[in-house]
């Protein structure tokens, strides 16, 4: 199925425009902004997603350090080209022609530069560090009971296959969850890591993507987990270019 | 659709057991956690406890030594157990689905089964 | 444990009337980190199980007519008829899920 028939709507993406005009009468959906066709069974990529948003109305230690090459989304929101598959261009442009290229993930990964530069392929954010804050607890969480609803969180909530959850890490009331996921390992139909990210990014900010959802509650043994703070870290399969400018 | 469907004695003596069984369909039990409320006659709600997805419980704490919640996953039965019943647990039992994620909303009840405690 | 009061304990009205009643918890409800309130309004009509109206404290269900309206944040919460239909005689139930479940004790509502 693509959309709920019943009512025709997008089941995973709210921010569509959903009419009965698909083969034999079946309800289609079309995202904001793009105007392109999205699979309602899976979720949207985040590219088509960003742009919807912008044509909206506005013990041991056993925590990850993230890499020296690790990217944060620092520059926020802007308005992004995306390929036919609903997938960002490497090469983002805005509107008094200032450039940039960017990773599967839309994050930034050059210095910007004129429309003269150039970016020769999209490369692949592999490897991404989701960092919580929690809420004080009466009592730390239990590592594993966290684990494993984090782990079905992501694996029923975002689709996403299990082996691409690579670990969670606990250190109250620190979180960590790393995902990874090469070209290689990717099939088809397979959800991408940066796509069930952003979806958990916005879910725990209470701006759920899904259609007719309120928020995100989520409990481990009953306890509601209550995030302050959220840091994610995108690592490339290829590192990042700045100049040392940027880095002093 | 989804649906729960409670069974269980209607009437129990002093200081015996209570043991409802609620059976749901349209929905996994490894999916979604089961709620159980009660409700005395003439008066208001009362939750019980909680079969939780994942397997673990929660309990009033209330009611904590008297109550056990259990589920088979593969029959889609979740099961209460009451201990040394008094006429005062006479009432209205209600099994009720969570929402999982999108919150501990009870959006789908069972039709409930009347208890009552007497000799 | 969290306790929640509900007032008045019953209001007798006429059909066309406005209505408001009340929900207190005894501590904040309220989510930080998504700025939402754990908190749930059910309507329990004879002889039925309860049906849920509100959720997220003003997020209205599918199927539940506009006239129903929940408002409020932190501890103080509002359920509020606009218009009362003499299908909407019931008793209305406020319940948490900030810390476990607790449900208000109810608040019915009768024709005058």
């Known amino acids: 199925h693509t959309a709920a028939q019943d009512n025709c709507t997008c089941p995973t993406n709210k921010m569509t425009v959903c009419s009965p005009d698909g083969p034999g009468g079946r309800c289609q959906c079309r995202a904001l902004g793009s105007g392109m066709a999205v699979d309602c069974s899976t979720l949207t990529s985040k590219c088509l997603l960003l742009k919807a948003r912008m044509s909206a109305p506005k013990n041991a230690r056993t925590l990850v350090r993230p890499s020296e090459h690790a990217l944060v989304d620092n520059d926020g929101l802007y308005d992004p080209d995306c390929d036919p598959e609903g997938r960002f261009k490497a090469r983002q442009c805005n509107q008094t022609s200032v450039c940039w290229c960017v990773n599967s993930v839309g994050v930034r990964r050059t210095d910007k530069g004129d429309l003269s530069l150039r970016c020769d392929e999209l490369v692949r954010t592999h490897h991404i560090l989701i960092d919580l804050r929690h809420r004080p607890t009466a009592g730390a969480f239990n590592h594993s009971d966290l684990d494993a609803e984090l782990r079905r969180l992501f694996r029923e909530r975002y689709r996403l296959h299990p082996k691409f959850v690579a670990a969670v890490h606990y250190e109250q009331p620190t979180i960590q969850i790393e995902l990874r996921q090469n070209t290689s390992q990717k099939a088809a139909g397979d959800v991408d890591i940066g796509d069930a990210a952003y979806y958990f990014e916005r879910d725990i900010k209470g701006e759920s993507l899904f259609q007719g959802r309120g928020g995100l509650d989520l409990r481990v043994r009953g306890e509601p987990l209550q995030v302050e703070r959220t840091l994610i870290y995108y690592l490339d399969e290829i590192p990042p270019k700045f100049s040392m400018k940027r880095l002093t | 659709q989804v649906q729960l469907k409670q069974s269980g004695p209607g009437l129990v003596a002093p200081s015996q057991s209570l043991s409802i069984t609620c059976t749901v369909s349209?929905?996994?039990?490894?999916?979604?956690?089961v709620n159980w409320i009660r409700q005395p006659p003439g008066k208001g709600l009362e939750w019980l406890g909680v079969?939780?997805?994942?397997?673990?419980?929660n309990y009033n704490s209330a009611l904590m030594s008297r109550l056990s919640i259990s589920k088979d996953n593969s029959k889609s039965q979740v099961f209460l157990k009451m201990n040394s019943l008094q006429t005062d647990d006479t009432g209205m039992y209600y099994c009720a689905r969570d929402e999982n994620w999108d919150g501990a909303w009870f959006a789908y009840w069972g039709q409930g089964t009347l208890v009552t405690v007497s000799a | 444990d969290i306790q929640m009061t509900q007032s008045p304990s019953s209001l007798a009205v006429s059909a066309g009337e406005k209505v408001t009643m009340s929900c207190k918890s005894s501590?904040?409800?309220?989510?930080?980190?998504?700025?939402?309130?754990?908190l749930a309004w059910y309507q329990q009509k004879p002889g039925q199980s309860p049906k849920l109206l509100i959720s997220w404290a003003s997020s209205r269900e599918s199927g539940v007519p506009d006239r129903f309206t929940g408002s409020g944040s932190g501890t103080d919460f509002t359920l509020t008829i606009s218009s009362v239909q003499a299908e909407d005689l019931a008793v209305y139930y406020c319940?948490?899920?900030?810390?476990?479940?607790?449900f208000g004790g109810g608040t019915k509502l009768e024709l005058k």
């Open positions: 349209g929905f996994s039990l490894t999916s979604y956690g």
């Open positions: 079969m939780w997805a994942g397997g673990s419980t």
């Open positions: 501590q904040s409800l309220l989510n930080s980190g998504t700025r939402k309130n754990y």
């Open positions: 319940k948490q899920s900030y810390n476990l479940f607790t």
